[in-house]
Interface confidence: medium
């Protein structure tokens, strides 16, 4: 079986994940995308997903999470904002193909967030907070219910992520201050 | 084979502004990381910021963010460095250079691996 | 922002030599490092990338290792083109930043 891999990002509360899944773009560009988080020994839970058919860059948010998927690049741009240190835990970007099982699209992404200011300069206590004004979605996006047995992990650490009502603005500290560390498998 | 052309060497003013292009030619353009590095003469590397294009919105060192703007165009597949209010000090080579990434959110994993000619700016009054 | 300090800051070497430069980093940034060269009035080049992994097109003589906050470019055998200025940068988070550099030159 081939191994799966994760990229791990370290962040503050407060700050935004702000990820790309790229996918296959002849096969996928207007397939319905979502945005999964996977729970210790439970099947992965859909937090966001993109319309179906997928549009062509625009922005689906559901609470603090942003999708958008850009056809042209074969990606989907995953964006959570104003982290919680309760959001803490592994994702991953699956591809909707019914009758077929959910394509997962590699790496997964285990996030891990602390509590306490990030102390990166340009983004302190005292600056102006940025804003991202994000138009709200005319359509809801409806996301299938079903899961992929097979993506079941046994030790991912448990965690909530926090859905909330959508929102047509959301402000944002700390939105430059994008952390990636690697992980090698 | 990716290769990024900058635009041409630059004499300016105490006080004045200068504006800095790359252009990319082969490869794709709109999803890797642009960031723009410069050095001064007999200095090391100075990272100023850096845009993913497709994304639109840069990131600034902070010794620069209240004096640079960066900026790209996906049509032409060129982005900019514009310097506002040039001291002597910003007498310096500028380079751009591109950082990718092959996978899930990989933005820049390769580090930043083609890069620029550079660009000669002289601050001079 | 992240600082890194590499050492020593300048080195002189014989062709053949083994060298080692090391880059620490302020606080851990796990494995995003990459390390360049730079000859005089050219722009760097890239030889490694995250952290061990030897870009293309760069001779096997150079390697990285490391991860966190210490990291070390060994070249294994001197050549007489490997003569120039070397850097690492961490891409972990912004801003992106650079060591000070390290001046290899002919004994």
């Known amino acids: 079986a081939t191994k799966l891999t994760e990229e791990k990002y370290e962040l503050k509360e407060g700050q935004t994940l702000d990820v790309k899944c790229d996918y296959t773009l002849e096969k996928f560009a207007s397939s319905q995308k979502a945005w999964q988080i996977i729970r210790d020994g439970e099947m992965p839970k859909t937090l966001a997903c993109t319309e179906r058919p997928s549009k062509n860059s625009h922005p689906v948010q559901v609470g603090r999470i942003i999708l958008e998927d850009y056809h042209d690049h074969g990606l989907l741009r995953v964006r959570m904002v104003n982290l919680q240190v309760e959001d803490s835990g592994l994702y991953q970007c699956v591809i909707y193909q019914p009758p077929k099982e959910p394509h997962m699209l590699f790496d997964r992404i285990r996030l891990v967030v602390t509590k306490g200011f990030s102390g990166t300069p340009g983004s302190n206590e005292n600056s102006t907070q940025n804003v991202y004004k994000i138009p709200p979605t005319t359509t809801k996006a409806l996301c299938p219910l079903y899961t992929s047995p097979r993506t079941v992990t046994q030790a991912p650490p448990k965690s909530t992520a926090d859905v909330s009502t959508p929102d047509s603005e959301i402000n944002l500290t700390n939105v430059t201050d994008i952390i990636r560390v690697p992980v090698f498998n | 084979q990716v290769q990024l052309v900058q635009s041409g060497a630059e004499v300016k003013r105490p006080g004045s502004s200068v504006k800095v292009s790359c252009k990319a030619s082969?490869?794709?353009?709109?999803?890797?990381?642009i960031s723009w590095v410069r050095q001064a003469p007999g200095q090391g590397l100075e990272w100023m910021g850096g845009?993913?294009?497709?994304?639109?919105?840069?990131n600034y060192a902070q010794q620069f963010q209240d004096r640079v703007t960066i900026t790209a165009d996906e049509s032409t597949r060129t982005a900019y460095m514009e310097l506002n209010s040039l001291k002597s000090e910003d007498t310096a080579v500028y380079y751009c250079?591109?950082?990718?990434?092959?996978?899930?959110?990989?933005?820049?994993?390769?580090?930043?691996?083609?890069w620029g000619q550079g660009t000669t700016v002289t601050v001079s009054s | 922002d992240i600082q890194m300090t590499q050492s020593p800051t300048s080195l002189s070497a014989s062709v053949g030599d083994r060298v080692t430069i090391t880059c620490r980093a302020s606080?851990?940034?796990?494995?995003?490092l990459a390390w360049y060269q730079q000859k005089p009035e050219k722009a760097p080049k890239s030889l490694i990338y995250?952290?061990?992994s030897l870009q293309s097109g760069v001779p096997s003589r150079f390697s990285g290792s490391g991860s966190g906050t210490d990291f070390t470019l060994t070249i294994s055998s001197l050549q007489p083109e490997d003569f120039a200025t070397y850097y690492c940068?961490?891409?972990?988070?912004?801003?992106?930043?650079f060591g000070q550099g390290t001046k290899l030159e002919i004994k």
């Open positions: 250079a591109r950082g990718h990434g092959p996978g899930s959110s990989h933005y820049s994993y390769y580090g930043l691996d083609v």
């Open positions: 606080q851990g940034i796990s494995s995003w």
């Open positions: 940068q961490q891409y972990n988070s912004y801003p992106y930043t």
């Open positions: 082969g490869g794709t353009f709109s999803i890797y990381v």
């Open positions: 845009i993913i294009p497709l994304f639109g919105t840069p």
């Open positions: 995250a952290a061990s």
